[in-house]
């Protein structure tokens, strides 16, 4: 069955920095979405070889692509605190196939030590169930942030 390899699992970056998310498949795609998860999932990009990519207005002017739809690296620039979240690749084939997710933690420079990624993939959270015609890795991607120290305030 088709799979999407997504990396990294998690990354911590300061405000204003960039992050690379790579979505790799064995080919045979119609295209690929990068979606920010949450109660109201938000498409960030849709990329299809030979077609002008669609980019959400929030990220317009700060997204770059390299590679092809089968092995796509998406670079998000000038990250803001509000960009913190879990991003998942959705490959469109004859079914929907999902990556394992990338948890992006955007921190103010002085608070970087408070929130850092563990080695584990993003942990499962209250995500919508995938469509029935979909292939989704188990466990599902996570959108939960690591627990901060009691004294800290998350943005």
């Amino acid at each position: 069955a088709q799979e999407v390899q997504q990396s990294p699992h998690c990354t911590t970056v300061p405000v204003g920095a960039s992050v690379n998310i790579t979505c790799s498949t064995s080919g045979g795609l119609r295209g690929i979405y990068l979606r920010q998860l949450g109660p109201q999932p938000q498409d960030i990009i849709y990329y299809e070889d030979g077609v002008v990519p669609t980019t959400d207005r929030r990220f317009r002017g700060r997204i770059d692509f390299s590679g092809s739809q089968d092995n796509l690296t998406i670079t998000m620039h000038r990250l803001q605190l509000s960009d913190t979240g879990t991003y998942t690749c959705q490959a469109i084939t004859e079914v929907n196939v999902y990556g394992s997710g990338t948890l992006v933690l955007v921190t103010e420079e002085q608070s970087q030590g408070w929130h850092r990624c563990s080695d584990a993939p993003p942990r499962a959270s209250a995500l919508p169930a995938p469509p029935t015609g979909s292939a989704l890795p188990d466990p599902q991607t996570a959108s939960a942030l690591p627990d901060p120290p009691a004294a800290s305030a998350l943005p």
């Epitope: 999932p41 938000q42 498409d43 849709y46 084939t93 469509p131």
Partner: antibody, heavy 117, light 107 residues
Framework: EVQLVESGGGLVKPGGSLRLSCAAS????????MSWVRQAPGKGLEWVAS???????YYADSVKGRFTISRDNAKNSLYLQMNSLRAEDTAVYYC???????????WGQGTLVTVSS | DIQMTQSPSSLSASLGDRVTITCSAS??????LNWYQQKPGKVPKLLIY???SLHSGVPSRFSGSGSGTDYTLTISSLQPEDVATYYC?????????FGGGTKVEIK
């Protein structure tokens, strides 16, 4: 059981506006792309618009700039705002669950929009 | 846009007959083809997706085949409840486009 129920159709004059709604039940609405397809009286099917689960929107050239598709995941609802309506927009409008970017596996019962002076 | 040409536009066959409907795309669609059935006065229903996959609950007398630009829907043994209009639809590229339909009647 997955159910889609359209509403909001009716008679409108050319140049007028109408907002169609589609209430979904029996599915995790936020996980699915959704589409509108129309069928003019005695004619075939025509795709109108789609919205991905993450909110990207796509339109047929015939409605681009006049129609707006939107969704409210909290209300399990899909919408089609139709402006500057023309006689040729007269049709039954169906909402459909878009299982895999174009594979429309569940359809509502349809709502009739008539544009006439 | 990808044009979908369906033929015949209508046909009349006897109960038990094998019925074949064809759909031709103006460019290759990589098997991203669906077939829908619409009975008179009713809502379209998905029959076959991705060229040959039978949608749940669809009788096994329906089958689909094809590749590239040419696709076929076959009803192996026509039944009274198969009286309907059948539409093909490509979903390889936006905009999604439908064939003009084939009306199937019983002789």
């Amino acid at each position: 059981e997955v159910q889609l129920v359209e509403s909001g159709g009716g008679l409108v004059k050319p140049g007028g506006s109408l907002r169609l709604s589609c209430a979904a039940s029996g599915l995790t609405f936020s996980s699915y792309a959704m589409s509108w397809v129309r069928q003019a009286p005695g004619k075939g099917l025509e795709w109108v618009a789609s919205i991905s689960s993450g909110g990207f929107t796509y339109y047929a050239d015939s409605v681009k700039g006049r129609f707006t598709i939107s969704r409210d995941n909290a209300k399990n609802s899909l919408y089609l705002q139709m402006n500057s309506l023309r006689a040729e927009d007269t049709a039954v409008y169906y909402c459909a669950r878009d299982e895999v970017r174009g594979y429309l596996d569940v359809w509502g019962q349809g709502t009739l929009v008539t544009v006439s002076s | 846009d990808i044009q979908m040409t369906q033929s015949p536009s209508s046909l009349s066959a006897s109960l038990g007959d094998r019925v074949t409907i064809t759909c031709s795309a103006s460019q290759g669609i990589s098997n991203y083809l669906n077939w829908y059935q619409q009975k008179p006065g009713k809502v379209p229903k998905l029959l076959i997706y991705y060229t040959s996959s039978l949608h749940s609950g669809v009788p096994s007398r329906f089958s689909g085949s094809g590749s590239g630009t040419d696709y076929t829907l076959t009803i192996s043994s026509l039944q009274p409840e198969d009286v309907a209009t059948y539409y093909c639809q490509q979903y390889s590229k936006l905009p999604y486009t439908f064939g003009g339909g084939t009306k199937v009647e019983i002789k």
